[in-house]
Interface confidence: low
Amino acid sequence: TGTTDVIVAYNLTWKSTNFKTILEWEPKPINYVYTVQISPRLGDWKNKCFHTTDTECDVTDEIMRNVKETYVARVLSYPADTVLTAQEPPFTNSPPFTPYLDTNLGQPVIQSFEQVGTKLNVTVEAARTLVRVNGTFLRLRDVFGKDLNYTLYYWRASSTGKKKATTNTNEFLIDVDKGENYCFSVQAVIPSRRVNQKSPESRIECTSQEKAVSRETGHHHHHH
């Protein structure tokens, strides 16, 4: 195989969770390299992952400029010993990607919980994103606002019948039976989306009259 033989990239796929966004493709290159370009408008291309032998490229910094914009990337194939020429190398375009609509919601973490009498209070950790404004990072709630809901699935520890509660904050306060232990998990939901509406469910936590151990953090939570 000559060094000028290149294969056009295929299976271009966006992998994105809480706005951390990576473009993946195939195949592994032999004697050639890839350059990724990304643009919110076809033709105004920005180079990323220049002359790489990887088959993935982190484009988070670029898509963060405007998470409601629609982006297209393309993967260009160059011979490994290439010199820059005016000739355009072969390339493949990605599917369009709109971060605000298309990024997957990450698994939520239950920050804390407490059962007092007939009330169960559950707080979801305010997940940070990689959306950066002036060098600092926004929380999921800051980006999605009221579009972001959380669903709490809860059930008596002694039974399997699940109940459901929803909030557009990061806190739940629900009525439970006094003296009963409860188990629960949470899920992030964006109801206005057509796809990628729901996150994976969080780890399950359970209350106890003395204490419960969070499997997420390994720390002890004390309860009444």
Epitope: S112, A126, R128, V133, G135, R139, G145, H219
Partner: antibody, heavy 124, light 108 residues
Framework: QVQLQQWGAGLLKPSETLSLTCAVY????????WSWIRQPPGKGLEWIGE???????RYNPSLKSRVTISVDTSKNQFSLKLSSVTAADTAVYYC??????????????????WGKGTTVTVSS | EIVLTQSPGTLSLSPGERATLSCRAS???????LAWYQQKPGQAPRLLIY???SRATGIPDRFSGSGSGTDFTLTISRLEPEDFAVYYC?????????FGGGTKVEIK
Amino acid sequence: QVQLQQWGAGLLKPSETLSLTCAVYGGSLSGYYWSWIRQPPGKGLEWIGEIGASGSTRYNPSLKSRVTISVDTSKNQFSLKLSSVTAADTAVYYCARDTPYYYEGGYYYYMDVWGKGTTVTVSS
Amino acid sequence: EIVLTQSPGTLSLSPGERATLSCRASQSVSSSFLAWYQQKPGQAPRLLIYGAYSRATGIPDRFSGSGSGTDFTLTISRLEPEDFAVYYCQQAGVVPYTFGGGTKVEIK
């Protein structure tokens, strides 16, 4: 270097509305969270609430029904309003910048810039 | 609400001595969101430690933070005259963000 300058009425009667403003000099409102904290005479610090870069707000539930925090990006200012004040609202009120910081895979969150404080007294 | 309990309320020490301040949370707190502040009379609080362990810009290395879960500690290895002040811990992980009641470090 970012500095916060705050001002507002220092003496109020019960049932009036406390109104304070904090101006950001040497930096932008964008990308940070902006908090109000108060400290009653001889006591500790109490977080009142914050406004985020996107305009989203979070309030202390104990004050939520009376508090409004707003932002004016054109003036690089944010403001606190606390309605129906009583003597229990007498305190030094501070504005502060909350900085979320990402480093080596972890997030940190802290108040790194503070105003000098405004003494507010509620008395009939 | 996460309650932060600081102890002791007052610490009477001499310059050059070691100060150990405790902050205990009513529920587990992510160390990423635990900070320590110093406050002197008539002044605003000043950030000392963030992320439970990291010194803020310009803070001398005699200040150090440690701990995790529900128990956190601020240590001043050798007290300087300017270190006599009130120290507060704060959690910023769960709304409402809360401060401890403070520990006053005074000259013995």
